[in-house]
């Protein structure tokens, strides 16, 4: 119900959004689920990661970047059929440090657009944004000299998966806090598509048992569990052919083949 | 730092109107959902009304649905709630609230409201 | 309308653990907040989503919620720490509190 922003006086850009919706804030609902979805950002002019709680919020929310573009971003579509030319930094390294509501103590990296540099942070462990790496190597890697990729654009490759403080796939608890652990997922040359295809089932935090589907990236098929009606996360649909539609494309048979469709 | 001072409490007869201001300080202010809670005296507490920042949507108890109007001034950073059709049972004191991702994060003091004949 | 249900009273001795729970319906699937109030005073949040605390807090307020149930527990409660204390949740765009619940620090 809040409109939750920053504490700042900066008006908003010039920039009109295609919908009187796309200018409201990051609205996460008072619910505990935690699903990765997207909003467009009108200080910013992107569309930026945030996690949703799974219940009220308000309508800007996509499930997917592409859809918060082109729902957001006037004349996105004209723009993303051009061929992309070199490389380009993804959004989330122009996001602001965020250590998130936790009180772990990890060291990370994060790419400072002031300075055009990675530099180390500290992370509390949970939440927080996508600007957030194990290693220096991997921050460079993707924000200070990203290197032209050949796959899917807007399809987000495992390294932003693999530090993504936002994901929960192991659970273990600090002071009663979800506290992401690193997944263990097949290595990065493997698999090519959407990262949350790579997480494990999980049945989430509620008492109902609905029937879900999730895909075994080990296996290569999308297998049946039980759901229990929030939190969990993204690998789960409602049919078999919906997550093989959105899983199985993202393998790679073969790294001179590319990516099987 | 974060200030909400009410006004605008009193005595006031039963089918009477009142109209409570809230000013804000410390904070943006047009960014922020806004809510009045009540406590009548000796009770627990009792959300009357909600609006949503710098977007026009308001929400109301069922007790006060078409008797109270909340709404807000930006430019002086200040939230009222016009309450007309009073009665005994509103007795109580009137508290302003900053609504932060669905709980109340700053309150105000609060003004009492007396109905009574 | 929606229910949450508190003890409208919990004593503890000074130094003993007091625990003040919260049912509803929602519960699992909804966050649960906490204020204190002391006597003529406005309430202030003391457990945020379930269990976080706010800064100026002190450690000793904990606060969990699981099945139906959310519950706020004070360790080594001190004379200070008597109050009425309500959780809070959201639904359907409105917030609801439970009844209160008055703690008593015996002695």
């Known amino acids: 119900l809040s409109e939750e922003a920053d504490d700042t006086d900066s008006e908003l850009g010039s920039m009109k959004p295609l919908h009187t919706f796309c200018a409201m804030k990051a609205d996460d609902g008072p619910c505990k689920a935690m699903i990765r979805s997207y909003f467009f950002n009108m200080y910013t002019h992107q569309c930026e990661e945030f996690i949703y709680g799974g219940c009220e919020g308000n309508e800007n929310r996509f499930d997917t970047l592409e859809e918060c573009k082109k729902t957001c971003i006037p004349g996105y579509e004209k723009t993303a059929v051009k061929a992309a030319s070199g490389a380009e930094r993804p959004d989330f390294c122009f996001l602001e440090e965020d250590p998130g509501l936790c009180r772990g103590y990890m060291k990370r990296y994060l790419y400072n657009n002031q300075t055009k540099q990675c530099e180390r942070f500290v992370y509390g462990g949970c939440l927080g944004n996508r600007n957030n790496f194990e290693t220096l190597d991997e921050c460079k890697k993707i924000c200070e000299n990203p290197v032209h990729s050949p796959s899917p654009v807007n399809e987000v490759q495992m390294s932003d998966y693999v530090t993504d403080g936002n994901t929960v796939t192991d659970r273990s608890t600090v002071n009663n806090i979800v506290v992401p652990q690193s997944p263990k997922v097949p290595r990065r040359r493997d698999y090519r598509g959407r990262p949350w295809c790579l997480q494990p089932a999980d049945s989430g935090l509620c008492k109902a048992s609905e029937r879900r589907f999730y895909y075994n990236s080990a296996t290569g098929k999308c297998h049946r569990f039980n759901y229990t009606g929030c939190g969990g996360n993204n690998n789960n649909f409602t049919t078999r052919r919906r997550c093989l539609r959105s899983c199985k494309t993202g393998l790679i048979k073969n790294k001179s083949k590319g990516v099987v469709k | 730092q974060v200030q909400l001072v009410e006004s605008g409490g009193g005595l006031v007869q039963p089918g009477g109107s009142l109209r409570l201001s809230c000013a804000a300080s410390g904070f943006t202010f047009r960014v922020y959902g806004m809510s009045w809670v009540r406590q009548a005296p000796g009770k627990g507490l009792e959300w009357v009304s909600s609006?949503?920042?710098?977007?026009?949507?308001?929400y109301y108890a069922d007790s006060v649905k078409g008797r109270f109007t909340i709404s807000r001034d930006n430019s002086k950073n200040t939230l009222y709630l016009q309450m007309n059709s009073l009665r005994a049972e509103d007795t109580a004191v009137y508290y302003c609230?900053?609504?932060?991702?669905?709980?109340?994060?700053?309150w105000g003091q609060g003004t009492l409201v007396t109905v009574s004949s | 309308s929606y229910e949450l249900t508190q003890p409208p009273s919990v004593s503890v001795s000074p130094g003993q653990t007091a625990r003040i729970t919260c049912s509803g319906d929602?519960?699992?699937?909804?966050?649960a907040h906490w204020y204190q109030q002391k006597p003529g005073q406005a309430p202030v949040v003391v457990i945020f989503?379930?269990?976080n605390r706010p800064s100026g807090i002190p450690e000793r307020f904990s606060g969990s919620n699981s099945g139906n149930t959310a519950t706020l527990t004070i360790s080594g409660t001190q004379a200070m720490d008597e109050a009425d204390y309500y959780c809070q949740s959201w639904l359907s765009g409105t917030p609801w509190f439970g009844g209160g619940t008055k703690l008593t620090v015996l002695g």
């Open positions: 609006d949503r920042g710098s977007r026009s949507s308001t």
């Open positions: 609230a900053r609504v932060y991702r669905y709980w109340f994060d700053y």
């Open positions: 929602n519960l699992p699937k909804y966050y």
């Open positions: 989503r379930d269990s």
